[in-house]
Each structure stands twice: as structure tokens, then as C-alpha cells.
């Protein structure tokens, strides 16, 4: 008995060939011997089966002795043994229809779980193997689960269903809703304007939801909301903004926030959360702000940084075009009785300068100038 695998919703063509290459009488029946279709001369006739409106044949092939049964919009319950009767012969074809669907929506938030469920006919024992867009293979039976979806899981998942040494392939497009970056860090000198950007890693026709930037300043004992906003069809409207700092927010995507001035009291880390319409759960992006200040008080030249710096970062004070006078893995460095000239405060990571602030030290009889 020939086995044919079909996909739910697809069209399948079951073949039936006579030895004579001409149009002769044929019938297709199901396992209950109910006629599906056949011919009467050059006319197609249909029986009382449930397939009535979805069954067809190809009249153009009859003259060549081919009498296919075409079933459109396949359903799992179409799985059956189909019998073609032609020239006193019976050809049996076993059709097995499978369906593979994603648990809920194919648009899932980063960190959520994807469950793929296989619909299969009774009595079948298929195996399923799926390959994610990043090449990860998962195997299973009736259900396959992937927990903690990542951005790289966005794309086409290819799943192969194996039954009776035959296979059928399913392709499911999955969109992982996430920010492009999980975390970002902004380095600024005191007084500079700060720009925070939160680009999304997906595009949808209409984007509606709401969000908040929650901030933990390094110098504050508790965290607080800096801004709350709504998003309607990709248009941003501010709901509430704290009075200090007075953030500004762009009206269009990508989500964009402006802090008028980088000040030590704002240095710290924030979490932008975005809730999307019809989704339970939220998208998150961490953002960090490091602020540098260089000052001269009496005979002491000081450079300080505030905010989340890694222990391997180096803070240095040097006179322009000279070797560093002081260089430490600390958040504050100073030089006593600095020479006159342009001093540079540098925050660097393995030699790469992340942040630089210049301060002019004048001869001792005058006051310092900050460029």
C-alpha cells in the first residue's frame, strides 16, 4: 500500500494509473467504500462523501490513462485509505494528513516560550524535528517547546515530520519581539546633552502599547519613574514625566529620550519597559549613564566619574601630550599642585578612550578656565 503524507490546508494529488493509455471508467472510494468521484464517459461524477466539494480530478490526463484524485484544503480527518478502481484493479493509497501550529501567536516577546503542536491522525506515530533560524535542532513528538526565546530565534523555523519513512516539511515564521540591544551605556561629560535610543528589532504595521523608563541613580537610595508614555500606531505621547530631570521624548519610533544635561545625580542605570497591545509581558532594555566631571579647587585637580563603570576601566589625569600623571582603576583621581596647561581626564577601557574631559589650569596667580 502506497503512503502519501499531506499538510493541513494544502492540496494533495493521489495518483491512479491504468495500463491502457486511454480514458476508461474509474472510481475513487474511501475505506468505507463510499464513492468520492469517478467518471461517466468524459464527465466527472461525484459521490456522497464528505469530500464532495473539495475533491476533483484532472480530465486532461484521463486520455493518458491517469485518473488522479485531488483533495483541496486538506483536513486531519481526511486521513484515510483511498481506493482507486480501474480495469478490475484496485489501487490503495494511504493518506496521512498532519498539521503543525504555533501555540498562540507567531509574534512572541523575547524570553517567552514557543510551543509547536503537531496534529496527527489517530494511529500514526510521527516524529518531528525542527530547525531554528540560528541552526538549533529540537526534536519531539506531539509537542515541541523552546523556552526563553532570543532575538536570533526570529525567522523561519523548518520542521520535518517523519512517518513510514516518508517526510513532510512545514515552515513557520516566528517573530521575536525585542529591542535591538539588551543593554546600552552612554558616557557623557557633565553638562552635555544625553540621547537615549531604544530601537526595536522588529517591524509591524501598527504598534500600540505603553511604557516607562524606571531609573536607579547611583547617588539615590531608591529607584523612580523618569517618564511614562503611550504608543498608538507608532506615535508616542508622553503620559507623565518627572520634574527632575525633565526628559523629552521623540514623537516617532524609534523610542528616543533626551536628557537636557548630564549631571552626577542622574548617573546610574535605567530600565525601559514596553508593553505591547494584546501581549502579556513586557520588553526590556537596560540603559546606563556614566557622567564625568573635572574640577580644580585651590591646589587640587580632581577627575570623577559616576555611574555603572566596570572595575577594569581606567581613570587618568594627564597634561596634554605628556604621560599620565595619575592612572587608577577607581572612580576618582586627583593631582595636587598641577602644572599650568591643558589637562585631560580620560576614562578608558584597554587603551580605548570612552570619555574625555579637558580642563585648563592657569598659572597659580589666576583662576582656572573650563573650555
Amino acid at each position: 500500500k502506497k503512503v502519501v503524507l499531506g499538510k493541513k490546508g494544502d492540496t494533495v494529488e493521489l495518483t491512479c494509473t491504468a495500463s491502457q493509455k486511454k480514458s476508461i471508467q474509474f472510481h475513487w472510494k474511501n475505506s468505507n467504500q463510499i464513492k468520492i468521484l469517478g467518471n461517466q464517459g468524459s464527465f466527472l461524477t461525484k459521490g456522497p462523501s464528505k469530500l464532495n466539494d473539495r475533491a476533483d480530478s484532472r480530465r486532461s490526463l484521463w486520455d493518458q490513462g491517469n485518473f488522479p484524485l485531488i483533495i483541496k484544503n486538506l483536513k486531519i480527518e481526511d486521513s484515510d485509505t483511498y481506493i482507486c478502481e480501474v480495469e478490475d484493479q484496485k489501487e490503495e493509497v494511504q493518506l496521512l494528513v498532519f498539521g503543525l501550529t504555533a501555540n498562540s501567536d507567531t509574534h512572541l516577546l523575547q524570553g517567552q516560550s514557543l510551543t509547536l503542536t503537531l496534529e496527527s491522525p489517530p494511529g500514526s506515530s510521527p516524529s518531528v524535528q525542527c530547525r531554528s533560524p540560528r541552526g538549533k535542532n529540537i526534536q519531539g513528538g506531539k509537542t515541541l517547546s523552546v523556552s526563553q526565546l532570543e532575538l536570533q530565534d526570529s525567522g523561519t523555523w523548518t520542521c520535518t515530520v517523519l512517518q513510514n519513512q516518508k517526510k513532510v516539511e512545514f515552515k513557520i515564521d516566528i517573530v521575536v519581539l525585542a529591542f535591538q540591544k539588551a543593554s546600552s551605556i552612554v558616557y557623557k561629560k557633565e553638562g552635555e546633552q544625553v540621547e537615549f535610543s531604544f530601537p526595536l528589532a522588529f517591524t509591524v504595521e501598527k504598534l500600540t502599547g505603553s511604557g516607562e523608563l524606571w531609573w536607579q541613580a547611583e547617588r539615590a537610595s531608591s529607584s523612580k519613574s523618569w517618564i511614562t508614555f503611550d504608543l498608538k500606531n507608532k506615535e508616542v505621547s508622553v503620559k507623565r514625566v518627572t520634574q527632575d530631570p525633565k526628559l523629552q521624548m521623540g514623537k516617532k519610533l524609534p523610542l528616543h529620550l533626551t536628557l537636557p544635561q548630564a549631571l552626577p545625580q542622574y548617573a546610574g542605570s535605567g530600565n525601559l519597559t514596553l508593553a505591547l497591545e494584546a501581549k502579556t509581558g513586557k520588553l526590556h532594555q537596560e540603559v546606563n549613564l556614566v557622567v564625568m566631571r573635572a574640577t580644580q579647587l585651590q591646589k587640587n585637580l580632581t577627575c570623577e566619574v559616576w555611574g555603572p563603570t566596570s572595575p577594569k576601566l581606567m581613570l587618568s589625569l594627564k597634561l596634554e601630550n605628556k604621560e599620565a600623571k595619575v592612572s587608577k582603576r577607581e572612580k576618582a583621581v586627583w593631582v595636587l599642585n598641577p602644572e599650568a596647561g591643558m589637562w585631560q581626564c580620560l576614562l578608558s577601557d584597554s587603551g580605548q578612550v570612552l570619555l574625555e574631559s579637558n580642563i585648563k589650569v592657569l598659572p597659580t596667580w589666576s583662576t582656572p578656565v573650563q573650555p
Epitope: 539615590a220 531608591s222 523612580k224 520634574q243
Partner: antibody, heavy 119, light 107 residues
């Protein structure tokens, strides 16, 4: 530790006035919006009014507009609710609450002050 | 004003039961929804903010879901200390409004 303590509740005749106070401690009071929420005996919660950090923005539920006034004194870390033209239906426990939670939630509440309007 | 409708108004349950309370807003409120627990003679306590985020210090048996107009608070395995009244509250637009409350009682 964040603490909110209401005071000034009591028995007042219909048409009378009362001023509720809420003393805040354990946080930077001037950085937060504050709310008043009330609960009539045996009933549910009803949001009454709120005020922004510097007192320039105020919002009220329709049923108290023109009779109840929310205000604050950041120098004294205090929130107030001035209640005039009181009615029997204003009888309730009045809670002051901090709008310091994420997504505009009320994260800290006082223990409440009972206001009874009766002749 | 946005009306918040909670159901059921009361529920009798046993320790270990799974309990779900629903809250429906008369118009879309995105995720501007919080859930509070109140015990007799006490002030309300925040459980869930932003429709689905668990407040720090709240046991993980509490969870929130939904967005737009339909929201659910679920207690996965009811504990003796969970017998209380629960309120949903919208913070989408003024005046802020609460649901009428759902009393969770011992069966």
C-alpha cells in the same frame, strides 16, 4: 523606611469642614506625586485626588470637585486634603498614598483616617 | 470615566486552590492596571503593576495577565494569608478608578 501617617479625621456635621494631613518620611517627598483614596464603611476603594511633585497639577474625581482640595508642603513633607461642604456620603476612611510604584501604581499607603459626616 | 468591573464579587476557595479574578475596563487602558490586596482594617497593598509585573516582595504564586480591556489576577495555589479582598485599578486616565473588589473567602 517609607512611612505615611494620616491625621485630622473625626466627626463633623453635614456642611462642615475638616482638614486631613499626611506626614511623609523615609523618602524624598518632593520627588513624588501623591494621592488620596477613600473607602466608605463596608465598601470598595475610591480614588479621590492627586497632586504632582510641586503642587502645580491637581486632579479630582467629579463627586468632590469644588468641595475637596488637595495640597502639599514639600518643606514640611506633608500632604493635605481640605474638605468643605461635607456630605454624609463623604463618610469614609481616607488613605494617603504615594504614586511611586512602577507603571503609576500606588506603592505605599498610610493606615487611614476615619472621617464621619453625621448630624 | 473608565468603569472597572471585577468578577466574581466573591469566591469561596480552599487552601491550595487556583483562583482567578477578572477585571474588565469599559475602554482600552493598555497595560495601565494594578492589582491590590486588602485585609480588614488595613491599607491596600500592591501586588501587580503594569498588568503583569510582580511587585518586589510579592510571592510568585500571584500573577497578572491581559492588556487593553481584559485582565486577570491568578493565585496559583491559595495560602491561608491570601484570604482578603482584591481590587484592580486603572491609571490610564483621570479620574483613576478601582474595580468594586473581589472577596476571597475560606470555603
Amino acid at each position: 523606611e517609607v512611612q505615611l501617617v494620616e491625621s485630622g479625621g473625626g466627626l463633623v456635621q453635614p456642611g462642615g469642614s475638616l482638614r486631613l494631613s499626611c506626614a511623609a518620611s523615609g523618602f524624598t517627598f518632593s520627588s513624588y506625586w501623591m494621592s488620596w483614596v477613600r473607602q466608605a464603611p463596608g465598601k470598595g476603594l475610591e480614588w479621590v485626588a492627586n497632586i504632582n511633585e510641586d503642587g502645580n497639577e491637581k486632579y479630582y474625581v467629579d463627586s468632590v470637585k469644588g468641595r475637596l482640595t488637595i495640597s502639599r508642603d514639600n518643606a514640611k513633607n506633608s500632604l493635605y486634603l481640605q474638605m468643605n461642604s461635607l456630605r454624609a456620603e463623604d463618610t469614609a476612611v481616607y488613605f494617603c498614598a504615594r504614586e511611586g510604584g512602577q507603571w503609576l501604581s500606588l506603592d505605599y499607603w498610610g493606615q487611614g483616617a476615619l472621617v464621619t459626616v453625621s448630624s | 470615566d473608565i468603569q472597572m468591573t471585577q468578577s466574581p464579587s466573591s469566591v469561596s476557595a480552599s487552601v491550595g486552590d487556583r483562583v482567578s479574578i477578572t477585571c474588565r475596563a469599559s475602554q482600552g487602558i493598555s497595560s495601565w492596571l494594578a492589582w491590590y490586596q486588602q485585609k480588614p482594617g488595613k491599607a491596600p497593598k500592591i501586588l501587580i503593576y503594569g498588568a503583569s509585573s510582580l511587585q518586589s516582595g510579592v510571592p510568585s504564586r500571584f500573577s497578572g495577565s491581559g492588556s487593553g480591556t481584559d485582565f486577570t489576577l491568578t493565585i496559583s495555589s491559595l495560602q491561608p494569608e491570601d484570604f482578603a479582598t482584591y481590587y484592580c485599578q486603572q491609571a490610564n486616565s483621570f479620574p483613576w478608578t478601582f474595580g468594586q473588589g473581589t472577596k476571597v473567602e475560606i470555603k
